[in-house]
Interface confidence: medium
């Protein structure tokens, strides 16, 4: 179990000529809202296929009225995250669809009018529990900037949120603050609790008590923009006073990056991340067009012929950055399972597996299910050095020898009645509720022809699940 979270940072006209001035039609003011749809796997699916991993709508954004002669701004956005809960394992590979919708307010008579302004579809690999991934995408004449992550909830842990850690009444052999993990009784996992005050937006941690910063942020709590600080890079718990891993003057002191570039330390040197339109060791080269060949590593340059117009580099797989100058660390997503060693060969990823494991991602345990039998039609599932039985309906226990009641956990919400069924459990919902677990109200209160937020939301609520 867990939650996929999407944060929209900005939505506005893209660079270059022909960009729209306003999202609204000539009929008057409008407001924006976003829809996120998650589908499993990396295959191209029809737009009409269901969002099998889940979907969510944002609240409506503030009303936008175009100001004549004013520069086209980033548009006012809805507050809060879009959150899509997932009940089962996080698949790791998924298709992310973000739609930007316009709700027209010019005609107050009758029902609302919605138009799809932009749709972004990205096929992604993402491990649960990792830091925020950032992205910038063009959709027609619009540009969307967003971040996303998947995180486990309740007692689930691991990159797929499939391993359950449950506290035991027996005293743990693990150290303080650690909890025993099932089904591996001897393995202990610490839920990483970041350093107090660590920025939720710009920081993350992999070990308890640390605060590591996303690119462009620094300081002990990742609250200082990198370009204004003399202490940059990933921050560990080494120094309680400064948060700096390297004491004393560093290569980024005084910020050697020109034109708003942000500096990050590298071993014995520094690296500048340049804003669009600038490049060079210190972001000192400006007035760049595609004719100057600013896109490295085979990146495709798109831009106007006018010297003042911006350019955009479309990077090939494995590279990123405004000029495709950075190699993507594909091993940072920890694709190799069961302790396998990740090797990025450039053209491909390779996993070197520990003894007893095999497969492209070391996902197969060679001896888990050998000679093991699961009773009553159960199936043996490999994983983690100890076999596990996936039991048929009505049975449970380590080897599926115990009778189990699928309704025992009271899975039906809002007073729904649970019935055991040959293919699963069935919820008979109380009046006013629907869904496979009676989780959705049939008719949310307080809706009107032009709601200030999607039905069932009050202003300030972050999102509505679909």
């Amino acid at each position: 179990a867990g939650v996929f979270e999407l944060q929209i940072h900005s939505f506005g006209p893209g660079p270059g000529p022909g960009a729209p001035r306003s999202p609204c039609s000539a009929r008057g003011p409008c407001r924006l809202f976003f829809r996120v749809c998650l589908k499993p796997g990396l295959s191209e699916e029809a737009a009409e296929s269901p969002c099998a991993l889940g979907a969510a709508l944002s609240a409506r954004g503030p009303v936008y009225t175009e100001q004549p002669e004013a520069p086209a701004p980033d548009l006012p956005l809805p507050n809060g995250l879009l959150q899509v809960p997932f009940r089962d394992a996080w698949p790791g590979t998924f298709s992310l669809i973000i739609e930007t919708w316009r709700e027209e307010l010019g005609d107050q008579i009758g029902g609302p009018a919605w138009s799809l302004l932009a749709r972004v579809t990205r096929r992604r690999r993402l491990a649960a529990g990792g830091p925020w991934a950032r992205d910038i995408q063009r959709a027609g004449a619009w540009e969307l900037r967003f971040s996303y992550r998947a995180r486990c909830e309740l007692l689930a842990v691991g990159t797929a949120c499939t391993r359950l850690c449950r506290p035991r009444s027996a005293p743990s052999r693990c150290g303080p603050g650690l909890r025993p993990c099932a089904p591996l009784e001897d393995e202990c996992e610490a839920p990483p609790v970041c350093r107090a005050g660590c920025s939720l937006e710009h920081g993350f941690c992999e070990q308890p008590g640390e605060c590591r910063c996303l690119e462009g942020w620094t300081g002990p709590l990742c609250t200082v923009p990198a370009s204004t600080s003399s202490c940059l890079g990933l921050r560990g718990p080494s120094s309680a006073t400064t948060g700096c891993l390297v004491p004393g003057p560093g290569p980024c002191d005084g910020n050697p990056c020109a034109n708003g570039g942000s500096c990050s330390e590298t071993p014995g040197s520094f690296e500048c991340t340049c804003p669009r339109g600038f490049y060079g060791l210190r972001c000192e080269v400006s007035g760049v067009t595609c004719a100057d060949g600013p896109c490295f590593n085979g990146g495709l340059c798109v831009g106007g012929a006018d010297p003042d117009s911006a350019y955009i580099c479309h990077c090939p797989p494995g590279f990123q950055g405004s000029n495709c100058e950075k190699r993507v660390d594909r091993c940072s997503l920890q694709p190799c399972r069961n302790g396998g060693l990740c090797l990025d060969l450039g053209h491909a990823l390779r996993c070197r597996c520990r003894a007893g494991f095999a497969g492209p991602r070391c996902e197969h345990n060679l001896d888990d299910c050998a000679g093991r039998a699961c009773a009553n039609g159960g199936t043996c599932v490999e994983g983690g050095g100890a076999h596990r039985c996936s039991c048929a309906l009505g049975f449970g226990g380590r080897d599926c020898r115990e009778r189990a009641d699928p309704c025992a956990a009271r899975p039906c919400a809002h007073g729904g009645r649970c019935y055991a069924h040959f293919s699963g459990l069935v919820c008979a919902c109380a009046p006013g509720y629907m869904g496979s677990r009676c989780e959705f109200p049939v008719h949310p209160d307080g809706v009107s022809a032009l709601p200030a937020a999607p039905p069932g939301l009050r202003p300030g609520d972050p999102q509505r699940y679909l």
Epitope: A113, L116, P455, G456, L466
Partner: nanobody
Framework: QVHLVESGGGSVQAGGSLRLSCAAS?????MGWFRQAPQKEREWVAT???????????YYVDSVKGRFAISQDNAKNTVYLQMNSLKPEDTAVYVC????????????????????WGQGTQVTVSS
């Protein structure tokens, strides 16, 4: 192809209630109700999102807000219009409509948005 079947119409005194049902034979994105009174133009009444885009989002024409409630049963592919505090001016043939095509524009009050229509059911409110 989506087939729509309405039921639940009838005669009622002013202030009374009726519940209309519309069952769809296939997947839809929106389902709604229009009405047409004698010598009047067809009027949009209410619509609810039934597909995964705006699932459960309900919208109404101003004149019925607070009196009518549209709801759905996804398992049965059925939409209901609960009509309370009925007035003589609510007398009309009520027709169920559905949107099956994926679109980048949904203007719910426009009949042209809807691809499929039912036969209609008569609602008569006497004073």
């Amino acid at each position: 192809q989506v087939h729509l079947v309405e039921s639940g119409g009838g005669s009622v005194q002013a202030g009374g209630s009726l519940r209309l049902s519309c069952a769809a034979s296939g997947y839809t994105y929106f389902m709604g109700w229009f009405r047409q009174a004698p010598q009047k133009e067809r009027e949009w009444v209410a619509t609810i999102g039934t597909g995964d885009i705006f699932n459960g989002a309900a919208y109404y024409v101003d004149s019925v807000k607070g009196r009518f409630a549209i709801s759905q049963d996804n398992a049965k592919n059925t939409v209901y219009l609960q009509m309370n505090s009925l007035k003589p001016e609510d007398t009309a043939v009520y027709v169920c409509a559905a949107v099956q095509s994926k679109s980048s524009n949904y203007v719910l009050r426009d009949a042209s948005t809807y691809n499929y229509w039912g036969q209609g059911t008569q609602v008569t409110v006497s004073s």
